[in-house]
């Protein structure tokens, strides 16, 4: 409940907010959960705490893990957890699902794409914007403050948009990129009984103990904008939020994508530091709308080390 997922790329700045809120004058202490080691507040450190914020300047893959923040108020301490994953930079253009922020939808009248998490950073205009890795050029695209405005939106404008900006900390500059999908609302649409595209029913997913794993639940519900459509994960028949394992979280934003004109949603389940007991759990991908509910079950199995080396 008091845990939030954060992710970033190696050699970029990452700033994480404590999930617990308090007054500006309250002290916030940060710890690396695995070692219970206190995070320093001195800005000369690459990773340091600054009140409600934890700063990785820049981030390294080895920084991945669960961080604990404790907001110290006069009457009690509030504890929160930041589940941080730092990924290696991809050599190709594709942005993987696990690096995507929540999808936004636009129409001819409203086509703002906000740059995710930018409010946490000390940045100055202009923002750079890319679509499917290509720099955006032309009078239809306007970078304004922390968002991109697209004039005369068309169906072809749907895609993955990346914002790039520079975070400045004590005179040093760090690059930050963030990507989210943009969909264009189709006025004509219909809805169907949910169709789960992934995972396959009774799929066995191979994972490595001690590593991170991601499961994507993806389903389509019809064409055009859908009402009351959702995908979610359950563990042993229990909602993720009620299961009480901070290592296992589902991505807050649901990505809405249009595949062959179909409206699809996906929800990523992130398992940090896979443990033996995770292999005993039943993972259910649920897709539901007004027509009903469909469920696909996944189980985890340990990846054979021989397979891994080959």
């Amino acid at each position: 409940k008091f845990s939030k997922q954060s992710w970033g790329l190696e050699n970029e700045a990452l700033i994480v907010r404590c999930p617990r809120q308090g007054k500006p004058s309250y002290t916030v202490d940060w710890y690396y959960s695995q070692t219970n080691k206190s995070i320093p507040t001195q800005e000369r450190n690459r990773v340091f705490a600054s009140g409600q914020l934890l700063k990785f300047l820049p981030a390294a893959v080895a920084d991945s893990g669960i961080y604990t923040c404790i907001v110290r108020s006069p009457t009690f301490n509030r504890t929160g957890y930041a589940n941080v994953t730092i990924y290696k930079k991809q050599s190709d253009c594709n942005v993987p699902d696990y690096l995507m922020y929540s999808t936004v939808s636009g129409s001819e009248k409203n086509s703002k794409i906000y740059c995710p998490t930018i409010d946490l950073y000390n940045w100055t205009a202009p923002l750079e914007w890319f679509k499917n890795c290509q720099a955006l050029q032309g009078s239809r695209y306007r970078a304004h403050k922390s968002f991109l405005v697209i004039d005369n939106v068309m169906t072809e404008d749907a895609g993955d948009y990346t914002c790039k900006f520079i975070h400045n900390e004590n005179g040093a500059n760090y690059s930050v990129t963030a990507t989210r999908s943009f969909t264009v609302k189709d006025e004509q649409g219909f809805s169907l009984f949910p169709v789960i595209g992934a995972p396959a029913q009774n799929e066995i997913k191979e994972v490595e103990i001690g590593k991170n794993a991601n499961l994507t639940c993806s389903a389509c519900f019809g064409k055009g904008t859908q009402f009351l459509a959702a995908v979610l994960w359950q563990l042993n028949g229990t909602k993720i939020t009620d299961f009480g394992e901070p290592r296992i979280q589902q991505e807050e934003g649901q990505n809405q994508s249009f595949s062959n004109g179909l409206a699809c949603l996906d929800m990523v389940l992130r398992i940090a530091d896979v443990k033996e007991e995770d292999l005993l759990l039943q993972y259910d991908c649920l897709a539901l709308n007004l027509h009903g509910l469909r469920r696909h079950t996944v189980r985890l199995s340990r990846k054979n080390p021989i397979d891994h080396h080959s």
Epitope: K1, F2, K4, R17, P19, R20, Q21, K23, P24, S25, Y26, T27, R72, S73, P74, T75, G80, D119
Partner: antibody, heavy 116, light 113 residues
């Protein structure tokens, strides 16, 4: 500049529920909690509860537990306060107030009148 | 709950007078962790929204005239208007900003003689 804009006045019958909204602008909504305070005619201010706008966790005052529900919609930068089982003594002006070192920013207030 | 008791409940003073309002809390509002007193003062004019004057017992909110000052620690606090002005006619509330439930004093109504 920071602005909190609340929904309009409501007239309700005893036993009914009321839901008041508070739309925030001029700052990053999830950076600050949102409090709800009410003031009955000629009475002192009374704190009802607050919500952690980042994770959606509410905390309620003992006098209102079981009757009040505070929620938020981060995509709309809006906080909501719903009060159920209304009685005549719930007639008051309801305010949202942004958390900070005390309440520096308040909504304009929403008058809720409970009358049969 | 922390009880907040204000006195007087009302007062009448002349323009230019020094006005003092006191507020007592049933428990200490001092947080030893940072040595802050979590007490705030608000001004509310008839039919208007409360306005923050002082937080942390003595820190003036930006834009608040310097004639308003706050003092005190622990359980005893004071709001002082050094030279009362006609626009200061209002009800003044102290608030426990220390622990839930945040509680307010009963108010002090200030009028001009």
């Amino acid at each position: 500049q920071v602005q909190l804009v609340q929904s309009g006045a409501e007239v309700k019958k005893p036993g009914a529920s009321v839901k008041v909204s508070c739309k925030a602008s001029g700052y990053t909504f999830i950076n600050y909690g949102m409090n709800w305070v009410r003031q009955a005619p000629g009475q002192r201010l009374e704190w009802m509860g607050w919500i952690n706008t980042y994770i959606g966790e509410p905390t309620y005052g003992d006098n209102f537990k079981g009757r009040v529900t505070i929620t938020r919609d981060t995509s709309a930068s809006t906080a909501y306060m719903e009060l159920s089982s209304l009685r005549s003594e719930d007639t008051a002006v309801y305010y949202c107030a942004r958390e900070g070192d005390a309440f520096a920013y308040w909504g304009q207030g929403t008058l809720v009148t409970v009358s049969s | 709950d922390i009880q907040m008791t204000q006195s007087p409940s009302s007062l009448s003073a002349s323009v230019g007078d020094r006005v003092t309002i006191t507020c007592k809390s049933s428990q200490s509002l001092l947080y030893s962790g940072n040595q802050n007193n979590y007490l705030a003062w608000y001004q509310q004019k008839p039919g208007k929204v409360p306005k923050l004057l002082i937080y942390g017992a003595s820190t003036r909110e930006s834009g608040v005239p310097s004639r308003f000052s706050g003092s005190g620690s622990g359980t005893d606090f004071t709001l002082t208007i050094s030279s009362l002005q006609p626009e200061d006619v209002a009800t003044y509330y102290c608030q426990n900003d220390h622990s839930y439930p945040y509680t307010f004093g009963g108010g002090t109504k200030v009028e001009i003689k």
